[in-house]
């Protein structure tokens, strides 16, 4: 299970229309459910329940976002509509270029994601926990535009790759 180096860039717009960027680095793990490769995209926070196919909305079809999913305690959802792996697949089907799971409240999900699949996803499925997960969720909860860049080797300094 290789380390995933995740850089999150938060874009704050000023009244003049300029952007100030704030970069945060954190680490996670590439799971066997997906590919060990780099990915980048706008962060979209998704609730695990939102990855069920309950309603009749058509999908948005845009490609290239990074899904951030905070998994719930298993007892909150004793009969989940999909396994964690199934939810990762659903996100990729909906256009995610990568999925990051916060497994802090559901550590058993790590084993589910690492069981290995005959048909792993062709996009990275990363999990984070502990202080890294807190850092990530603090950024995501700001409800501002943010992008994530996932790499399988430490990022070069200075960080120059984000281009609006």
């Amino acid at each position: 299970k290789e380390t995933a180096f995740v850089e999150v860039v938060l874009f704050e717009s000023s009244p003049s229309g300029d952007y100030t960027t704030y970069t945060t680095g954190l680490t996670g793990r590439f799971s066997r459910a997906g590919a060990t490769l780099s990915a980048e995209g706008e962060i979209v926070q998704m609730h695990p329940l939102g990855l069920c196919n309950n309603n009749d909305e058509e999908d948005l079809y845009e490609y290239g976002w990074v899904g951030v999913v905070k998994l719930e305690q298993p007892e909150l959802d004793p009969k989940p509509c999909l396994t964690v792996l199934g939810k990762a697949k659903r996100a990729v089907q909906r256009g995610a270029t990568a999925v990051i799971f916060d497994v802090s409240e559901n550590p058993e999900a790590i084993d589910q994601l690492n069981q290995g699949s005959e048909d792993p996803l062709k996009r990275p499925v990363v999990y984070v926990k502990g202080a890294d997960a807190i850092k990530l969720m603090n950024i995501v909860n700001k409800q501002k535009v943010a992008r994530a860049r996932i790499q399988h080797r430490p990022p070069r300094q200075p960080t120059e790759y984000f281009d609006m």
């Epitope: 329940l49 990855l51 309603n55 509509c81």
Partner: antibody, heavy 119, light 107 residues
Framework: QVQLVQSGAEVKKPGASVKVSCKAS????????MHWVRQAPGQGLEWMGW????????KSAQKFQGRVTMTRDTSTSTVYMELSSLRSEDTAVYYC????????????WGQGTLVTVSS | DIQMTQSPSSLSASVGDRVTITCRAS??????LAWYQQKPGKAPKLLIY???TVESGVPSRFSGSGSGTDFTLTISSLQPEDFATYYC?????????FGQGTKLEIK
């Protein structure tokens, strides 16, 4: 940072049409559905329908089918809701609301547009 | 259509009280339930979604529970700013129906 700004109040005669706009900012416009909800004076909330800003696809409550038209302009990040054949019972505050991914709730709302239908 | 029934329709309580509002769906909606707070002349504000997930920025005194057809919104210790009307809403299937509202007033 996310903002939904709606057009101003309107007074219309029965049988006329009204078009309410909702301009979005602070997020990627095409990445979230927009819904319309109305509230008659002193009454509860009533869902009208949604538009997918990415494709322009729409769905409306059966009650409004044939009378409501939802459109969007991606160049200005604006959605529109037009209600035709107005009657007095259409007097209400009309809200646009962005929905969370997976349709779990409306996390941002416009300030509301009061439409008064009176002869 | 799925009917949503809230109870009570109105409720008088005092600052510091623990308050519970219930919402019942006419059929199983899993956990596709949201709660909103609305003050006069203002747009509704999302408090809770997916039955129990507290929206970012909402005080921790608000909590939600339930699954299937029966749901609860609890305010653990009422604050003066909590006096408002509360609505539940299902998003399991369109049309996305709301409860009729619960008006929370100062005793």
């Amino acid at each position: 940072q996310v903002q939904l700004v709606q057009s101003g109040a309107e007074v219309k005669k029965p049988g006329a049409s009204v078009k309410v706009s909702c301009k979005a900012s602070g997020y990627t416009f095409t990445s979230y559905y927009m819904h319309w909800v109305r509230q008659a004076p002193g009454q509860g909330l009533e869902w009208m329908g949604w538009i997918n800003p990415n494709t322009g696809g729409t769905k409306s409550a059966q009650k409004f089918q044939g009378r409501v038209t939802m459109t969007r302009d991606t160049s200005t990040s604006t959605v529109y809701m037009e209600l035709s054949s107005l009657r007095s019972e259409d007097t209400a505050v009309y809200y646009c609301a962005r929905v969370l991914r997976g349709s779990l709730g409306f996390d941002y709302w416009g300030q509301g547009t009061l439409v008064t239908v009176s002869s | 259509d799925i009917q949503m029934t809230q109870s009570p329709s109105s409720l008088s309580a005092s600052v510091g009280d623990r308050v519970t509002i219930t919402c019942r769906a006419s059929q199983d909606i899993s956990r596709y339930l949201a709660w909103y707070q609305q003050k006069p002349g203002k747009a509704p504000k999302l408090l809770i979604y997916a039955a129990s997930t507290v929206e970012s920025g909402v005080p921790s005194r608000f909590s939600g529970s339930g699954s299937g057809t029966d749901f609860t919104l609890t305010i653990s210790s009422l604050q003066p700013e909590d006096f408002a009307t509360y609505y539940c809403q299902q998003s399991y299937r369109s049309p996305y129906t709301f409860g009729q509202g619960t008006k929370l007033e100062i005793k």
